[in-house]
Amino acid sequence: SIPWNLERITPPRYRADEYQPPDGGSLVEVYLLDTSIQSDHREIEGRVMVTDFENVPEEDGTRFHRQASKCDSHGTHLAGVVSGRDAGVAKGASMRSLRVLNCQGKGTVSGTLIGLEFIRKSQLVQPVGPLVVLLPLAGGYSRVLNAACQRLARAGVVLVTAAGNFRDDACLYSPASAPEVITVGATNAQDQPVTLGTLGTNFGRCVDLFAPGEDIIGASSDCSTCFVSQSGTSQAAAHVAGIAAMMLSAEPELTLAELRQRLIHFSAKDVINEAWFPEDQRVLTPNLVAALPPSTHENLYFQ
Amino acid sequence: GAMGQEDEDGDYEELVLALRSEEDGLAEAPEHGTTATFHRCAKDPWRLPGTYVVVLKEETHLSQSERTARRLQAQAARRGYLTKILHVFHGLLPGFLVKMSGDLLELALKLPHVDYIEEDSSVFAQ
């Protein structure tokens, strides 16, 4: 049966026993800046082109054991959430991956900047259709990272990022705080903000909307046919990247402002229990859970 | 995210260093009174001192970026400091990534075309 997260973002017209919008997102390329990925996993084989870009810091600790499946875990899961054959949002989207996070899931602002520059240069060398850039990472507020995101957005690229898993104001983190980036918080099957250990999803006015981000089934790098459940604002951002890819595939000429407006327009409104947020943040945090457009757009979104 | 907000610095630390001296006889000395700023991550454990992104003013060409980076290296060498240019940015932002001692920040902030300098910091999978 359809996983809860795909059901949640799917308009009622499509809630049959399976989620299968044919070829969704096929005109769009989604760039993923994350860990290395297992690109031949059955769920994503042929859908993800691993670029030769790699800029990661060394792993911490003298006894760190580099295990390939662990190194690939985060990125493989997110690639599956965006475009996986069976558990993905935009099953027609093609992806390109850049490695900016090491085997411990750690990267640098500078490595991320160089990755964003790589995408811009690729775009200039070989202009393709609409581009979505997924940044499932967060660091402290960074003027330079926000500036780079702004420049890339002004070049027509749609950037989607994780709000952060710090149960804190997203405005204190980057790239979540960049105004031009679509910043995504995480909700669960009960439309509650996601709790992650002692922390949880970030919130506040720098968040644009929420999306499913708890117990999300996706490709596991443990084996080539394995699936695993993962949680976080990265998973939430991956849903929105997939939805954006489908919207842009249906309407390639959409501007960033129009896309943002559509994402907000089609979101479920006022379903999140705001009591989870600090009192002073409730009015500032958008009560929106991302969803695909309804069946009136069948000809556009499910062509 | 969330368009329409003002710039939000939060706990972000900003250190403004006024450009007082004109030592080293810079050929393209900055205009009087302009200041380049230094930024670093407010979360101490995430800081990566020793690596800095030197961001140059918007219209700076690649050749000027390279020249500015070389000038920094030359001036640092005269003071007995080793520096390494790790990357020269162009395409999105003009500037360069440099590995150097924090002692050289004041010198770097006085270079021509410099808009601001940011200390590198960590990002994490979410």
Partner: antibody, heavy 115, light 109 residues
């Protein structure tokens, strides 16, 4: 263009081993593994397993029961399928195909097991 | 796991439409979006005709179409032509492997 080229026909005695090769070209190797499929004379297709060019991982069909080994050599863009302790019912055409999706196939390698 | 169930043979006249069924379980056909169909002419390697239930690879005639309902997938060939005479195999994911149907011999009368 995307191509899978297999090694030539083999005749083996029962109990012997055979190693079939499959050279891939025209695409990014690490984006797909290689599936191995066999077809006995007059019979249908049988999936034998899959091997990764990315990390060498394998996924074998239960029926192989440890008699088969699949490997890859990314430096030569070649995948291999070795079958040991051959029996007469292993007589078949052995195909390699690209990935689990099996969208491109090799020309097939006939393996005859006969005493 | 056992093979998916296909009819041993079907036939049709040129210009007609035929449908080949492929029945599995909720653990294979019913549980995944990844049903493929292959055409195989005698002495030749199989050729992919339909992937992921209903998608056609480039170069495959639009006379070939695929669909799925529950645990049964179907291949429909419209406007039958002589060159369509061949064996047809369905294939599906299972949780850890892949399974083929027994094959259907299509005869164009």
């Amino acid at each position: 263009q995307v191509q899978l080229v297999q090694s030539g026909a083999e005749v083996k005695k029962p109990g012997a081993s055979v190693k079939v090769s499959c050279k891939a070209s025209g695409y990014t190797l690490t984006s797909y593994g290689i599936s191995w499929v066999r077809q006995a004379p007059g019979q249908g297709l049988e999936w034998m397993g899959w091997v990764s060019f990315y990390n060498g991982n394998t996924n074998y069909a239960q029926k192989l029961q440890g008699r088969g080994t699949m490997t890859t050599d990314p430096s030569t863009s070649t995948a291999y399928m070795e079958l040991r302790s051959l029996r007469s019912d292993d007589t078949a055409v052995y195909y390699c195909a690209r990935g689990y999706g099996m969208d491109v196939w090799g020309q097939g390698t006939t393996v005859t097991v006969s005493s | 796991q056992s093979a998916l169930t296909q009819p041993a043979s079907v036939s049709g006249s040129p210009g007609q439409s035929i449908t080949i069924s492929c029945t599995g379980t909720s653990s294979d056909v019913g549980g995944y979006n990844s049903v493929s169909w292959y055409q195989q002419h005698p002495g030749k390697a199989p050729k992919l005709m339909i992937y992921e239930v209903s998608n056609r690879p480039s170069g495959v005639s639009n006379r070939f179409s695929g669909s799925k309902s529950g645990n049964t997938a179907s291949l429909t060939i419209s406007g039958l032509q002589a060159e369509d005479e061949a064996d047809y195999y369905c294939n599906s994911y299972t949780s850890t492997s892949m399974v083929f149907g027994g094959g259907t011999k299509l005869t164009v009368l």
